[in-house]
Each structure stands twice: as structure tokens, then as C-alpha cells.
């Protein structure tokens, strides 16, 4: 399945919005830094592009879930959040179309269930971290920076797979 060119643009817009959402400097939050164990190998590496699409879909769905909580709404600018949701929603639609198109075609017996679980655990670690830090401004800034990094890595791997094909 070929994702539309708008998908790449949407990924870039998503990253831009995440950058604009920054409220405080990450340097003032160095004591709150945390390794969440992002499973980046599950987004590229030896896979074919079609195999990583369900994993990328899970990633974007989890980002959507993370930023659509009550605690998130209190932490970020509402206008930017709304634009952010719109971008994520569009990307989910693009990926869902690909997943449906790929059903019965891919030869992945487990639909990358292990990769999907790794992504879910990654986001649960983030959620637990926010809870432990009582959703402080620094905790949210650490999470925003982490999501920027992991989202960028996952979409870059997708792009490199696309260019290989």
C-alpha cells in the first residue's frame, strides 16, 4: 500500500505542532529525564513497509490517547491540541486504509503482535511516569520531547523503507 504524499506532510506538521506546544525549556527539567525504552527497531530494520504499518498505526493511536486525556488538556494550548488531534486523526485514517488493503496479502502470521505490545508497554511506561510525577509541567515537557523523538524516529524509518522500495 502506498501511503499518500499528504501522509508525509502530515507527519511533518505533527512534529511542527509538537515543537510549538513547548511551554518550558527542557534544560530546566534535566532532573526529570527518563529512559522510556522506545522500541525503535520495530518500525523498520529488516521489515517490509507493509509489515510496519500496523505498528505505526498503534504508535499514532497511542499518541492520540496520551494527548486526549483530561490531564493533557490542562497542560497544553487548546488551539494547538485541536490541530494536533486533526493531524493524528488524518494519519490514522491513511494507515487504516492501508491495513485494510493489506489484510490477506501480508505473510505476517502474527501481524507484528509482539511489536504492537512493545509499543503499548512503552506508552504505559510514559503514562505511569506522568502519574508518578503528578503530571507536573516538567514531566509533560519530558514526555513531549520524548514523543517528538520517537515519532520522528518511527516516521523516518517509514520514509527510509519507502525510498528503498
Amino acid at each position: 500500500c502506498d501511503l499518500p504524499q499528504t501522509h508525509s506532510l502530515g507527519s511533518r506538521r505533527t512534529l511542527m505542532l509538537l515543537a510549538q506546544m513547548r511551554r518550558i525549556s527542557l534544560f530546566s527539567c534535566l532532573k526529570d529525564r527518563h529512559d522510556f525504552g522506545f522500541p525503535q527497531e520495530e518500525f523498520g530494520n529488516q521489515f517490509q513497509k507493509a509489515e510496519t504499518i500496523p505498528v505505526l498505526h498503534e504508535m499514532i493511536q497511542q499518541i492520540f490517547n496520551l494527548f486526549s486525556t483530561k490531564d493533557s488538556s490542562a497542560a497544553w494550548d487548546e488551539t494547538l491540541l485541536d490541530k494536533f488531534y486533526t493531524e493524528l486523526y488524518q494519519q490514522l485514517n491513511d494507515l487504516e486504509a492501508c491495513v485494510i488493503q493489506g489484510v490477506g496479502v501480508t505473510e505476517t502470521p502474527l501481524m507484528k503482535e509482539d511489536s504492537i505490545l512493545a509499543v503499548r508497554k512503552y506508552f504505559q511506561r510514559i503514562t505511569l511516569y506522568l502519574k508518578e510525577k503528578k503530571y507536573s509541567p516538567c514531566a509533560w515537557e519530558v514526555v513531549r520531547a520524548e514523543i517528538m523523538r520517537s515519532f520522528s524516529l518511527s516516521t523516518n524509518l517509514q520514509e527510509s523503507l519507502r525510498s528503498k522500495e
Epitope: 525504552g37 522500541p39 527497531e41 520495530e42 518500525f43 523498520g44 530494520n45 529488516q46 521489515f47 510496519t52 505498528v55 505476517t108 502470521p109 502474527l110 507484528k112 503482535e113 509482539d114 511489536s115 504492537i116 505490545l117 512493545a118 508497554k121 504505559q124 511506561r125 505511569l128
Partner: antibody, heavy 117, light 111 residues
Framework: SVEESGGRLVTPGTPLTLTCIAS????????MGWVRQAPGKGLEWIGI?????TVYYTNWAKGRFTISKTSSTVDLKMTSPTTEDTATYFC???????????????WGPGTLVTVSS | AQVLTQTPSSVSAAVGGTVSISCQSS????????LSWFQQKPGQPPKLLIY???TLASGVPSRFKGSGSGTQFTLTISDVQCDDAATYYC???????????FGGGTEVVVK
């Protein structure tokens, strides 16, 4: 099926690599783990390599073991074995990863590693 | 580090009887259900009996039943057979995979 090889008698501090060979399936589609069992003792989860290549180790195994995979094998490298690492080492596959990375349903027969001076 | 405590460490059962093995985790397993049960006989690799706390693995007799959620789990073997003499292990999967672990094992002796 899966089968382990490479187990032997080594002296403490001598690195050793165990190999797991898969037959009848592609390693790129499955999560593969390593579990060990010291003589007369219980099972210990060492770590797992996911289909994409992400590796997770249990706390005590980090730094002591390295798991890697190629298209046909999964390797477990013991970086600097001690006498406490004497055990049978099992390689295992899970067909149920949605239920966690300990739900191994296909196991090799195991390979014995003895660390002694 | 997480601890999975299995009780009892050894249990004796008569053929046709029922055995219950408990597995208690010091912290909730992932998704409250990421717990597996294994059977191991001397000189053999472990065999998966139950995954997802209560789902029977392929080819496992329905005499084996897994139950529980979160931190407390039970494996029940009803209508015990001679062939059930083995050591049984639980294994827990956690949000942080560095904490994944097996229980200490329970030896089942069949009389």
C-alpha cells in the same frame, strides 16, 4: 522447531556464544526468548528479541548477556561467565505475544553450559 | 525487582483428585492478565499450559484451569492423572520487561 547449540565446559571469564537455529519458520516474524535453568533449580527468564530486533533483558542479565539475531539464528552471548552461570540454556518462541513476552509455547531441548576452573 | 511467589513448593495428590497452585506477584502483571503457566518434567524443556492467565494452550487437556488477575493467580488441576507428576511454574510479564520473571516452581507428586 528450535534447537540450541554451543553449550560446553568453559573457564570463568571466557566468553561463550550459544546459538538457536529455527526450522520451518522465519525468525523475522516471531519473538524469541532465552531461559535458563541451573541444575536442580527453577527457570530464569534471561531476555527476548522481538521480530523487529528490539531486545529486552531481565535486570540481572543486563551486561552479562547479549542477545542478537540473524535471518536464521538467535544468539546468546555470555560476556564473562561465572560459576553461577552453569545451567541448561533454552531458546523458545512465543505464538502469543499479545499475552506477554513470557508465553513461550515452542522450546528447544536446551544446551548445557558448565562454567568451572 | 518483581517477585512471583508460588505456593506450595510441593504438593501431593491422589489420582482423580484436585490440586491448586497459587502464584502471587509483588506487583500487577501487564494488562492484569499477562501470566503463563508451564509444566516441566525431568530432563525435558517446559511445556506451556496456560497463557493470558486463563487461556488453555493448544493440545492441553481441559483438566488444567488458570484463573486470577492482577497479582493473584491460580492453576487448578482436576481429575489428576499419573502423567501430571511434574514441576509447575508461573511466569509473569510486566510493563517494564526488565522485571519479567518465573515463579520458584511447585512440585506435584501423584500417589
Amino acid at each position: 522447531s528450535v534447537e540450541e547449540s554451543g553449550g560446553r565446559l568453559v573457564t570463568p571469564g571466557t566468553p561463550l556464544t550459544l546459538t538457536c537455529i529455527a526450522s520451518g519458520f522465519s525468525l523475522s516474524s516471531y519473538a524469541m526468548g532465552w531461559v535458563r535453568q541451573a541444575p536442580g533449580k527453577g527457570l530464569e527468564w534471561i531476555g527476548i528479541v522481538l521480530s523487529g530486533g528490539t531486545v529486552y533483558y531481565t535486570n540481572w542479565a543486563k551486561g552479562r548477556f547479549t542477545i542478537s539475531k540473524t535471518s536464521s539464528t538467535v544468539d546468546l552471548k555470555m560476556t564473562s561467565p561465572t560459576t553461577e552461570d552453569t545451567a541448561t540454556y533454552f531458546c523458545a518462541r512465543t505464538d502469543y505475544p499479545a499475552y506477554g513476552f513470557t508465553s513461550f509455547n515452542i522450546w528447544g531441548p536446551g544446551t548445557l553450559v558448565t562454567v568451572s576452573s | 525487582a518483581q517477585v512471583l511467589t508460588q505456593t506450595p513448593s510441593s504438593v501431593s495428590a491422589a489420582v482423580g483428585g484436585t490440586v491448586s497452585i497459587s502464584c502471587q506477584s509483588s506487583k500487577s502483571v501487564y494488562n492484569n492478565n499477562c501470566l503463563s503457566w508451564f509444566q516441566q518434567k525431568p530432563g525435558q524443556p517446559p511445556k506451556l499450559l496456560i497463557y493470558g492467565a486463563s487461556t488453555l494452550a493448544s493440545g492441553v487437556p481441559s483438566r488444567f484451569k488458570g484463573s486470577g488477575s492482577g497479582t493473584q493467580f491460580t492453576l487448578t488441576i482436576s481429575d489428576v492423572q499419573c502423567d501430571d507428576a511434574a514441576t509447575y511454574y508461573c511466569a509473569g510479564d510486566y510493563v517494564d520487561d526488565m522485571e519479567n520473571t518465573f515463579g520458584g516452581g511447585t512440585e506435584v507428586v501423584v500417589k
